[in-house]
Interface confidence: low
Amino acid sequence: MAKDNSTVRCFQGLLIFGNVIIGCCGIALTAECIFFVSDQHSLYPLLEATDNDDIYGAAWIGIFVGICLFCLSVLGIVGIMKSSRKILLAYFILMFIVYAFEVASCITAATQQDFFTPNLFLKQMLERYQNNSPPNNDDQWKNNGVTKTWDRLMLQDNCCGVNGPSDWQKYTSAFRTENNDADYPWPRQCCVMNNLKEPLNLEACKLGVPGFYHNQGCYELISGPMNRHAWGVAWFGFAILCWTFWVLLGTMFYWSRIEY
């Protein structure tokens, strides 16, 4: 390829621009995935207890991919500017590997959507909330995590159970085994609290008097952030893949035209 050709310069410029965008997207993807794995909503214990935290796996891959995309975009820009076949060959090989990882991350994140069902969290809550007789240490750890997370959720977000307070009455649960049904028809966190962290009116709460207990479920507050993050990782990743595909295609064409 003649290096003084203005068309080549223009094509080089386009490829460099494409790689700059890839680099920026890499940084953004890393930032997004770091935000996700930092667990701002403190919901990880609920996912961990389901024995399926693949969405976090997808986010960790996203962090790795984001960093790699940034580094590779720099490599690509150097290769294009120097018109070096060796550098660009390394760029292609590494980019294909990273591309494969990002495809895996996107598929994992996208398919997790169907996993966050009310029944998943309901089953887990009934089995693990205030379950003080687990079969092993790992279960004890998970039970504690689930109990703490639910306590915080119900208090902080003024909700009760997955679908509502009736969850605690309709189904058999560790909580009902541990507590007297008359004294604890649902956890104390379902009661409306005053500034002393006491139920505003315990008897009214136990009787289910409207205004003294929280009658909406917490499902939306759990699934909302998780689904948003999953969609973010999946669709942003997919957008990066689409853009990278065309940049890679262009770079391969450019590579094939570089003189030995």
Partner: antibody, heavy 121, light 112 residues
Framework: QITLKESGPGILQPSQTLSLTCSFS??????????VGWIRQPSGKGLEWLAN???????YYNPPLKSRLTVSKDTSKTQVFLKIAHVDTADTATYYC?????????????WGQGTSVTVSS | DIVMTQAAFSNPVTLGTSASISCRSS???????????LYWYLQKPGQSPQLLIY???SLASGVPDRFSSSGSGTDFTLRISRVEAEDVGVYYC?????????FGGGTKLEIK
């Protein structure tokens, strides 16, 4: 049976930071509705509430002292801590920690034996 | 802040007779939920305080039924039906309706 025990430095100088520890047993601060409060009593005087920490890590402080107080907990070690910054002689008192349970409507139902603190130059 | 007011000393009482200790709050401690956020504590000489009464009239566990408490939203009375030697000490009333929690100055029970 429920017990609480306070420990502290005994004597310290003005402008230093007072660090107190309340070690408890017989209840868990990870149980919903549980809290621990700090109260002090200058010799021969009445009781003054300082701070509370609840099971969900919420903290409440006596407003005039708030800027100097920090309460924290270590649930696994069943301990609660109180730090008072920039002490002066007016902080000389016996310091108590007490359990608070929301089932008793905020009553301090179990108290420690107290630890005496003297601020002197 | 809610101010709790108590007399420094009670009228001297004879062992076996009844005694009354009063407490007044600067604001009603009766919450709209029907609960009165008043407590009574006893501090025996050389000991830490102990809870006697919570929620104005509920007896704390382990407290003898010689102790009882009553009152309106702002005026409260602790009664000891048959005073015993072990009842000697300083009685504090306290409130937790509003932060900060506040205690009365304490009333010293005196025996004749």
């Amino acid at each position: 049976q429920i017990t609480l025990k306070e420990s502290g430095p005994g004597i310290l100088q003005p402008s230093q930071t007072l660090s107190l520890t309340c070690s408890f047993s017989g209840f868990s601060l990870s149980t919903s509705g549980m809290g621990v409060g700090w109260i002090r009593q200058p010799s021969g005087k009445g009781l003054e509430w300082l701070a509370n920490i609840w099971w969900n890590d919420d903290q409440y402080y006596n407003p005039p002292l708030k800027s100097r107080l920090t309460v924290s907990k270590d649930t696994s070690k069943t301990q609660v801590f109180l730090k008072i910054a920039h002490v002066d002689t007016a902080d000389t008192a016996t310091y108590y920690c007490a359990r608070i349970y929301s089932g008793n409507y905020g009553a301090m139902d179990y108290w420690g034996q107290g630890t005496s603190v003297t601020v002197s130059s | 802040d809610i101010v709790m007011t108590q007399a420094a000393f009670s009228n001297p009482v004879t062992l076996g007779t009844s005694a009354s200790i009063s407490c007044r709050s600067s604001k009603s401690l009766l919450h709209s939920n029907g609960i009165t956020y008043l407590y009574w504590y006893l501090q025996k000489p050389g000991q830490s305080p102990q809870l006697l009464i919570y929620q104005m009239s509920s007896l704390a566990s382990g407290v003898p039924d010689r102790f009882s408490s009553s009152g309106s939203g702002t005026d409260f009375t602790l009664r000891i039906s048959r005073v015993e030697a072990e009842d000697v000490g300083v009685y504090y009333c306290a409130q937790s309706l509003e932060l900060p929690y506040t205690f009365g100055g304490g009333t010293k029970l005196e025996i004749k």
